[in-house]
Interface confidence: low
């Protein structure tokens, strides 16, 4: 079974070269793997990385530069992703998603 993407879209504006932090509000009891995607206009949603809550480890997708993104859980219901050294091409809609089964 899969959980749907939930929550309101939040807008973040940052300058080139700066960092941004995005928060993912998780449903109660969400465990396992939390995936982060970037969806840019005219492109397929691209998974950037996923967070393994069992081992608290981050797994980057192939082709993603280490250090560009980081993700961590601040509480059981809240996950954050840091985007560093922003460039114009980082613009888009970032999603978090979980599913099981």
């Amino acid at each position: 079974k899969s959980s749907n993407l939930e929550g309101r879209t939040k807008s973040v504006i940052r300058q080139t070269g700066s960092s941004a932090e995005i928060t993912c509000d998780l449903a109660e009891g969400s465990t396992g793997y939390i995936h982060w995607y970037l969806h840019q206009e005219g492109k397929a949603p691209q998974r950037l990385l996923y967070y393994d809550s069992y081992t608290s480890s981050v797994v980057l997708e192939s082709g993603i530069s280490p250090g560009k993104y980081d993700t961590y859980g601040s509480t059981r219901k809240n996950l954050r992703m840091i985007l560093r050294n922003l460039i114009e091409n980082d613009s888009g809609v970032y999603y978090c998603a979980t599913w099981d089964g």
Partner: antibody, heavy 123, light 108 residues
Framework: EVQLVESGAEVKKPGSSVKVSCKAS????????ISWVRQAPGQGLEWMGG????????NYAQKFQGRVTITADKSTSTAYMELSSLRSEDTAVYYC????????????????WGQGTLVTVSS | QSALTQPRSVSGSPGQSVTISCTGT?????????VSWYQQHPGKAPKLMIY???NRPSGVSNRFSGSKSGNTASLTISGLQAEDEADYYC????????FGTGTKLTVL
Amino acid sequence: EVQLVESGAEVKKPGSSVKVSCKASGGTFSSYAISWVRQAPGQGLEWMGGIIPIFGTANYAQKFQGRVTITADKSTSTAYMELSSLRSEDTAVYYCARSLRDGYNYIGSLGYWGQGTLVTVSS
Amino acid sequence: QSALTQPRSVSGSPGQSVTISCTGTSSDVGGYNYVSWYQQHPGKAPKLMIYEVSNRPSGVSNRFSGSKSGNTASLTISGLQAEDEADYYCSSYGSGSVFGTGTKLTVL
């Protein structure tokens, strides 16, 4: 083992529409990208568009924008591709294909393919 | 969203190695490590041979290998066998998801 079973061959008139289905079994449906790829007789592969059911919205190749609609029914693990305003050049085998890994880009790793559906457009 | 460029045909004798190239741009092949290769026999659905530039799905022979340099990706088939005769297509993620023009491999 993941299996994709497509609907049967269709013969259509120019100007009409066709809707092809693709039923998935043997794996999680929602988190995998489903693409539609067509191949005209003697020609190469052409990506039409795709959908990741958990996202709900589809992406389309520019060439087919406005003429193709891709949907997915999570309750039946079935994806659909509808092509409208058919012309003779749309005569082709239409394949659905699923990515090898979850949450993947559409064309990056199409590890499972349907058997193909031949759509013939003729007056 | 134009197709990636592949040679129309390549050939080789059994036991030899052949390489098929796939040229794109910095917006597709050069910009992502998301190049795949598909094999297609006549009348059959394509089969994934390589993904993420150089990874082989389980069940695919290690005679097939992939690489990338700049905007060009390559598929190398070593120890050529008769059953390798087929059409080969590359693909890449980019501003649109695109396939290559296709290459017919003939085993002499």
